[in-house]
């Protein structure tokens, strides 16, 4: 009775993400077979959140627009090692939009989830970012510097990542 | 190439407003912000602040707040700056200058002159 | 506000020689330090950006160099068309601030 209720609970909160994502990968956490993780399909998934690269070419609002019809944001990165992690299922040629943005071109960065923006957990290419009017940040890579980040003008379209916190069942 | 083409000189009465124009060319006007620097003899140069030829937003240094309103004309590719109240302290030559990289002027229009007086 | 400071107001040279004018800054401004020319006539032209990059059409014998609160301007061989008012600027903080110029003129 227990176990029905579970999965009771388990399908009602499927349904829930259905409208945006018609599949789920789920993992088990842990030892416990009552708890999974799950990140929709074609995403990947790196400790408590899920990302997909959106291959679109779209300006930073649309970008942005686009993850959250998905129930996401364009992608906050908290840690080096979640950059790593992004960086590995992205194209050296091309440039990505983040979660982070001037908005008025005061050199006042902002990330999309108010996470605040924290200088010493930055990743800039040097010399970035130097322009007033360019006040949305891309991810791309630089052979000198490999992958870091670069302020750019916010209607020049480009492709983005999403990321979304795992859906918990 | 780039080009900056200011407004003639202005000798204007204390007290009253002058509105000063900066005309872009050779470049995609609304990709790059406008400043605004005045010149005078006690002062040297002074950033007076920044608009946004795309967003129309503007950046002021609190010194110019009340005195001087930046604002663009996109279609005409042309930057204005409206300077209010004017007193003797108004008195200089003043400068558009296209934004760069590297928060850097990289392109200065050849100056308005400004002069008030009685 | 950053304060930017150029000590020597004038300097007189000979053509042919080195100059060097130095500007300096009240905090650290990460290098963004620019160096504008300004002509008798009023004329004002960016020469060196971002501490040491050299503006398009700028001759080379201009150069600049510098970091933290200390930076220079330095001619390497003076021409007589480099008489001019030199200005350093900052673009680490707003408001950009300006140091109050050295004019150079001719032995």
């Known amino acids: 009775n227990f176990m029905y209720s579970k999965t009771v609970k388990r399908l009602s909160k499927l349904r829930e993400y259905q409208q945006y994502h018609p599949s789920l990968t789920c993992v088990m956490e842990g030892k416990d077979i009552e708890d999974w993780s799950c990140c929709p399909t074609p995403w990947t998934s790196f400790q408590s959140s899920c990302y997909f690269i959106s291959t679109g070419m779209q300006s930073w609002t649309k970008s942005q627009k686009n993850c959250s019809v998905m129930g996401a944001d364009l992608v906050v990165i908290n840690t080096r090692e979640e950059q790593d992690f992004i960086i590995q299922n992205l194209k050296r040629n091309s440039s990505y939009f983040l979660g982070l943005s001037d908005p008025g071109g005061r050199r006042h960065w902002q990330w999309v989830d108010q996470t605040p923006y924290n200088e010493n957990v930055t990743f800039w290419h040097s010399g970035e970012p130097n322009n007033l009017d360019e006040r949305c940040a891309i991810i791309n890579f630089r052979s000198s510097e490999e992958w870091g980040w670069n302020d750019i003008h916010c209607h020049v379209p480009q492709k983005s990542i999403c990321k979304m916190k795992k859906i918990y069942i | 190439q780039v080009q900056l083409q200011q407004s003639g000189a202005e000798l204007v009465r204390p007290g009253v407003s002058v509105k000063i124009s900066c005309k872009g060319s050779g470049y995609t006007f609304t990709d790059y912000s406008m400043h605004w620097v005045k010149q005078s003899h006690a002062k040297s140069l002074e950033w007076i602040g920044v608009?946004?030829?795309?967003?129309?937003?503007?950046n002021y240094n609190q010194k110019f707040k009340g005195k001087a309103t930046m604002t663009v004309d996109k279609s005409s590719t042309t930057a204005y700056m409206e300077l209010a109240r004017l007193t003797s302290e108004d008195s200089a030559i003043y400068y558009c200058?296209?934004?760069?990289?590297?928060?850097?002027?990289?392109?200065w229009g050849q100056g308005t002159s400004v002069t008030v007086s009685s | 506000d950053i304060q930017m400071t150029q000590t020597t107001s004038s300097l007189s040279a000979s053509l042919g020689d080195r100059v060097t004018i130095s500007c300096r800054a009240s905090?650290?401004?990460?290098?963004?330090l620019n160096w504008y020319q300004q002509k008798p006539d009023g004329t004002v032209k960016l020469l060196i950006y971002y501490t040491s990059r050299l503006h398009s059409g700028v001759p080379s014998r201009f150069s600049g160099s510098g970091s933290g609160t200390d930076y220079s301007l330095t001619i390497s061989n003076l021409d007589q068309e480099d008489i001019a008012t030199y200005f350093c600027?900052?673009?680490?903080?707003?408001?950009?601030?300006f140091g109050g110029g050295t004019k150079l003129e001719i032995k």
């Open positions: 600027q900052q673009g680490n903080t707003l408001p950009w601030t």
């Open positions: 200058a296209r934004n760069g990289n590297f928060y850097v002027m990289d392109y």
């Open positions: 608009i946004s030829t795309y967003y129309g937003d503007s």
């Open positions: 905090q650290d401004i990460s290098n963004y």
